[in-house]
Interface confidence: low
């Protein structure tokens, strides 16, 4: 004769408030004859959850038809779960007896706990932009999860970060928990196109972690480099001077030309190009008239980037006697 086994496959069952919980229980033998009852807890104070023969259990239904002759499935469903339903549930086989039934064997029990998914992580970066080589902090928050055990990881462009601090609150028992983590990230000059990712893994997510992202483009300022050059060729009595503003981010930029200290209001040609790393280049051309009266011309290209202090580069224009003669000759 096969020995009766009471099989409760789930050690832990996580359910959410308002949903229906299914508690599984199967037996391996029809003998001995007698009912299977469900209890919460153990000992004399245990609570009867379901008895097919007697009592009123409006929230409990059976998965199988218990009246069928060879039924070996005694699983139940409990509807409209509330926090009051948490605890360990046991299916218990009784041997039919007289004057009363005798407890014969209990299943190992299934602990029912309230499980709640964490909210989608929200990642927030620094309030102000910072230049490369400096460290910035990003925070990641997720709320409303249970149980308390949770895993949080940080990534930058797919590479896991190690410099972060994480707190889960509250420290004691609670219906739901929150996590907050702060990661320190060193900015690189090419980080305009970089991302930081906060990844949260929790038992309720069934192996599919939640992710929150932030773009480093919101946190970085790459200051420009300036170069002012005089073009060797000239057009008539004009010399072309170029100001190249390289590798800056964000795009916000103001460029002004000064001639011998006087700001020039006239239009200048310019082009803006985007580099592969997300930074920008700006090139501005300035045409200077050459005449015999102009022995010394000092040109200044001044750039104000993203509200920062202006930076400038000067060029003392080299106008050879030959050039001046040529320009004089060209003047009608």
């Amino acid at each position: 004769e096969e020995e009766l086994q009471m099989i409760q496959p789930e050690k832990l069952l996580l359910v959410t408030v308002g949903k229906t919980a299914t508690l599984h229980c199967t037996v391996t033998s029809l003998l001995p004859v007698g009912p299977v009852l469900w209890f919460r807890g153990v000992g004399p104070g245990r609570e009867l959850i379901y008895n097919q023969k007697e009592g009123h259990f409006p929230r409990v239904t059976t998965v199988s038809d218990l009246t069928k002759r060879n039924n070996m499935d005694f699983s139940i469903r409990i509807s409209s779960i509330t926090p009051a339903d948490v605890g360990t549930y046991y299916c218990v086989k009784f041997r039919k007896g007289s004057p009363e039934n005798v407890e014969f064997k209990s299943g190992p029990g299934t602990e029912m706990a309230l499980g709640a998914k964490p909210s989608a992580p929200v990642v927030l970066g620094p309030a102000a932009r910072t230049t490369p080589e400096h460290t910035v902090s990003f925070t990641c928050e997720s709320h409303g999860f249970s149980p308390r055990d949770i895993t949080l990881k940080w990534f930058k462009n797919g590479n896991e970060l190690s410099d972060f601090q994480t707190n889960v609150d509250p420290t004691g028992q609670s219906v739901a928990y929150s996590i907050r983590s702060t990661a320190r990230v060193v900015l690189d000059p090419w980080d305009v196109r970089s991302q930081v990712i906060c990844e949260v893994a929790h038992v309720t997510l069934q192996g599919d972690p939640l992710r929150g992202t932030a773009n480093l483009s919101e946190a970085i300022r790459v200051p420009p480099t300036l170069e002012v050059t005089q073009q060797p060729m000239r057009v008539g009595n004009q010399v072309n001077v170029t100001c190249q503003v390289r590798k800056f981010y964000p795009q916000s930029l103001q460029l002004t030309w000064s001639e011998n200290g006087n700001v020039c209001q006239r239009e200048t040609a310019s082009t803006l190009t985007e580099n592969k790393d997300g930074t920008y280049n700006w090139t501005s051309w300035f045409l200077v008239n050459i005449s015999d009266q102009r022995d010394d011309v000092v040109l200044t290209c001044q750039v104000k980037h993203d509200g920062q202090l202006a930076v400038s580069k000067r060029l003392a224009l080299e106008v050879t006697v030959h050039q001046k003669d040529q320009s004089s000759d060209a003047t009608p």
């Epitope: 959410t16 929200v122 409303g144 609150d169 219906v175």
Partner: nanobody, 118 residues
Framework: QVQLQESGGGLVQPGGSLRLACAAS????????MSWVRQAPGKGLEWVSD????????YYADSVKGRFTISRDNAKNTVYLQMNSLKPEDTAVYYC???????????GGQGSQVTVSS
């Protein structure tokens, strides 16, 4: 640590008004939708109203529509519930909480008792 503190409850006659406030701390308040729920004596939690993170959109249960107004001040990390034309059936403990993307509610405050009685 996430903290929610409700205030402004009290005893009021039918037809009267109350304004509840919920001060939030320990999380980035402006990034989260917020909600008010209530629990009447001997009953389960009942949803009352939601407000989006930016404050632009609000939602109300049919039982309070036209009488209650939810609002928020992200600068003060506070959400409010203005309750007008109160009825005895509005008697309950009122709780505020944050909402995640799926609409799941996370509370944590002690609640504010509102009693409507003549």
């Amino acid at each position: 640590q996430v903290q929610l503190q409700e205030s402004g409850g009290g005893l009021v006659q039918p037809g009267g008004s109350l304004r509840l406030a919920c001060a939030a701390s320990g999380f980035t308040f402006s990034s989260y939708d917020m909600s008010w729920v209530r629990q009447a004596p001997g009953k389960g939690l009942e949803w009352v109203s939601d407000i989006k993170s930016g404050g632009g959109r609000t939602y109300y249960a049919d039982s309070v529509k036209g009488r209650f107004t939810i609002s928020r001040d992200n600068a003060k990390n506070t959400v409010y519930l203005q309750m007008n034309s109160l009825k005895p059936e509005d008697t309950a403990v009122y709780y505020c909480g944050s909402l995640d993307n799926s609409g799941a509610y996370t509370g944590g405050g002690q609640g504010s008792q509102v009693t409507v009685s003549s």
